[in-house]
């Protein structure tokens, strides 16, 4: 058993049929010694008396808010949560496996630049009685500070018969140098509580590996005389690290119709302009990627050909 | 501690091409090592990230773009002094700071070159003959060092009398290649910045 936060405790249980469970001793936070009784949740049934209560925690029915009273007055509370371990593996029932970039990916994180700011998100099908708490650091043995905000519900989607909820959190490394060469990874830890179930999820990464620039901005077209060709120009996204001559991007320019199966023109360039062949009913799209360290491409920025 | 904005004329910077070749060569070598040593811990997640130049050179700090010198987090650098005469310095106006940056890059390359050559000598003794260093990568390191053209004491190649542990050598190769790729990215960024300035 360990304390998650004040008056909230996590009981770690090996979860298998007829498991013996864990013996837990609760102590009432009071100077009083006599006349103390214990109850669980909203029940008025007295579970025991005295300053301490010893219970055998085996299942979710044994978890919940234990309260000690004296003469109708509440003295203190202890909330017990269960953390299940099945076949030596901690449960991951609360969050959905996003399977990208690999199986057992519950947390996904991205950074728009090298400033030390990043966003992580996760998915769940649970809509109520759900809380998240996020902590982060650079390195684990001698951790350096990373400050995370509160996790918020950022999107709701319908997937078949199910509703899917996306939560996200923004974090900022306390003292980040965009030009630094990372040798210790960022660690992100998410505590998830659904009703009386506790789970924790972690992710470890270097900022350089989660870079995904914003799409290029200000796409403009200039038809070339006596030619099917069009000059397309754009600018670096505002959110990208500066100076751009140090933090350079490379670009992919594509002309394509509405269907992915349609024919296309595609060219890669380090410049902020390119010449492509425009077709009726097609769009010109441009996306960006760090020129020197190949992490993710940005989303496309698009303009119609006409 | 930082790169000045008034540096060589565009297109007059011979090291840019070499640094691009360097990043390409080390990236290819790292990819080859990951594939060949698939049953060894050779991915970024599996290895310890070590920097053999730590406390010996200060490339990131010495080569910091002027725009980042206002960032306090970028300025906790170690002061290191280097010899300052390089052929990549294509302008007479080149500052001492830029010379310091380029000489720091030269020292990095020299240290990695020695490590890689020592390691290759060990790998050539491996009866499995599983992996060797790409000669192209070693040649590209050499070309960039020649383009930088700094006079520097030659570092003797480390020789070892004991029987090499090939498993450890291959893991060390992975560690070295990961670190060198990160440094090659920094070098490429620096050369691009200098070329544009």
């Amino acid at each position: 058993i360990w304390e998650l936060k004040k008056d909230v405790y996590v009981v770690e249980l090996d979860w298998y049929p007829d498991a013996p469970g864990e013996m837990v001793v609760l102590t009432c936070d009071t100077p009083e010694e006599d006349g103390i009784t214990w109850t669980l949740d909203q029940s008025s049934e007295v579970l025991g008396s005295g300053k301490t209560l010893t219970i055998q925690v085996k299942e979710f029915g044994d978890a919940g808010q234990y309260t000690c009273h004296k003469g109708g007055e509440v003295l203190s509370h202890s909330l017990l949560l269960l953390h299940k371990k099945e076949d030596g593996i901690w449960s991951t029932d609360i969050l959905k496996d996003q399977k990208e970039p690999k199986n057992k990916t519950f947390l996904r994180c991205e950074a728009k630049n090298y400033s030390g700011r990043f966003t992580c998100w996760w998915l769940t099908t649970i809509s109520t009685d759900l809380t998240f708490s996020v902590k982060s650091s650079r390195g684990s043995s001698d951790p350096q500070g990373v400050t995370c905000g509160a996790a918020t519900l950022s999107a709701e989607r319908v997937r078949g018969d199910n509703k899917e909820y996306e939560y996200s959190v923004e974090c900022q490394e306390d003292s980040a140098c965009p030009a630094a060469e990372e040798s210790l990874p960022i660690e992100v830890m998410v505590d998830a509580v659904h009703k009386l179930k506790y789970e924790n999820y972690t992710s470890s990464f270097f900022i350089r590996d989660i870079i995904k620039p914003d799409p290029p901005k200000n796409l403009q077209l200039k038809p070339l005389k006596n030619s099917r060709q069009v000059e397309v120009s754009w600018e670096y996204p505002d959110t990208w690290s500066t100076p751009h001559s140090y933090f350079s991007l490379t670009f992919c320019v594509q002309v394509q119709g509405k269907s992915k199966r349609e024919k296309k023109d595609r060219v890669f360039t380090d410049k902020t302009s390119a010449t492509v062949i425009c077709r009726k009913n097609a769009s010109i799209s441009v996306r960006a990627q760090d020129r020197y360290y190949s992490s993710s491409w940005s989303e496309w920025a698009s303009v119609p050909c006409s | 501690r930082n790169l000045p904005v008034a540096t060589p004329d565009p297109g007059m910077f011979p090291c840019l091409h070499h640094s691009q070749n360097l990043l390409r060569a080390v990236s290819n070598m790292l990819q080859k090592a990951r594939q060949t040593l698939e049953f060894y811990p050779c991915t970024s997640e599996e290895i310890d990230h070590e920097d053999i130049t730590k406390d010996k050179t200060s490339t990131v700090e010495a080569c910091l773009p002027l725009e980042l010198t206002k960032n306090e987090s970028c300025l906790n650098s170690r002061e290191t002094s280097f010899i300052t005469n390089g052929s990549c310095l294509a302008s007479r106006k080149t500052s001492f700071m830029m010379a310091l940056c380029l000489s720091s890059i030269y020292e990095d390359l020299k240290m990695y070159q020695v490590e890689f050559k020592t390691m290759n000598a060990k790998l050539l003794m491996d009866p499995k003959r599983q992996i060797f260093l790409d000669q192209n990568m070693l040649a590209v390191i050499d070309e960039l060092m020649q383009a930088l053209n700094f006079n520097s004491e030659t570092v003797p190649q480390k020789s070892s009398l004991e029987e090499p542990d090939f498993y450890k050598t291959k893991i060390k190769l992975c560690i070295l290649l990961h670190a060198f790729r990160i440094r090659a990215v920094t070098i490429d960024r620096v050369m691009s910045y200098l070329n544009a300035s």
Partner: antibody
Framework: QVQLVQSGAEVKKPGSSVKVSCKAS????????LHWVRQAPGQGLEWMGW????????EYAPKFQGRVTITADESTSTAYMELSSLRSEDTAVYYC???????????WGQGTLVTVSS | DIVMTQSPLSLPVTPGEPASISCRAS??????LHWYQQKPGQAARLLIY???QSISGVPSRFSGSGSGTDFTLTISSLQPEDFATYYC?????????FGQGTKVEIK
């Protein structure tokens, strides 16, 4: 399976014209760009131009501009390359090639030898 | 026009040995480079597109690398069927241009 079948060899006199055909099978004809590339004996490959069969748009290499005409007939899934004012240095194998991507070629025809000789 | 220069023009190789062909562009072309194989009397066959992207059906011993002006096609272990002429082609700008070709011959 996508295939490009070209017309047979031709012998032409200098100053005349030649029209080579390229019939496509497998896949929708207008879903691909079609190019013409030639190869003189013992020489390398030389790009001549492309057509978008969907709308008839064409683009030619400056070297052949005014002398080459690429056309396409959607009803027969056939593309044509006509080269006029032939000279001896136009003796070459002419290939048609296609792709959904405009700038490179993933399927090639078997080639048509055009010999220009007096 | 962008000029593509291949080297060597002739490459004698022992079967089973690796082979590398170089292609250099007269100006930077990013990764807009493609590789083809051509055997005598046959049409060309696409091997690699956009410098390093492999084609399904092409053996994994063929790989490409490079960007900017310098590119390499590598055949990790030459098989008898690989003796042919190899061409690089740039697609950075029109007109599309090819290298002169590299003939890989049996040593």
């Amino acid at each position: 399976q996508v295939q490009l079948v070209q017309s047979g060899a031709e012998v032409k006199k200098p100053g005349s014209s030649v029209k080579v055909s390229c019939k496509a099978s497998g896949g929708t004809f207008s879903d691909y760009y079609l190019h013409w590339v030639r190869q003189a004996p013992g020489q390398g490959l030389e790009w001549m131009g492309w057509i978008d069969p969907e709308n008839g748009d064409t683009e030619y290499a400056p070297k052949f501009q005014g002398r080459v005409t690429i056309t396409a007939d959607e009803s027969t899934s056939t593309a044509y390359m006509e080269l006029s004012s032939l000279r001896s240095e136009d003796t070459a194998v002419y290939y048609c090639a296609r792709n959904k991507e405009l700038r490179y070629f993933d399927v090639w025809g078997q080639g048509t030898l055009v010999t220009v000789s007096s | 026009d962008i000029v593509m220069t291949q080297s060597p023009l002739s490459l004698p190789v022992t079967p089973g040995e690796p082979a590398s062909i170089s292609c250099r562009a007269s100006q930077s072309i990013s990764i807009n480079l493609h590789w083809y194989q051509q055997k005598p009397g046959q049409a060309a066959r696409l091997l690699i597109y956009f410098a390093s992207q492999s084609i399904s059906g092409v053996p994994s011993r063929f790989s490409g690398s490079g960007s900017g002006t310098d590119f390499t096609l590598t055949i990790s272990s030459l098989q008898p069927e690989d003796f042919a002429t190899y061409y690089c082609q740039q697609s950075n700008s029109f007109p599309l241009t090819f290298g002169q070709g590299t003939k890989v011959e049996i040593k």
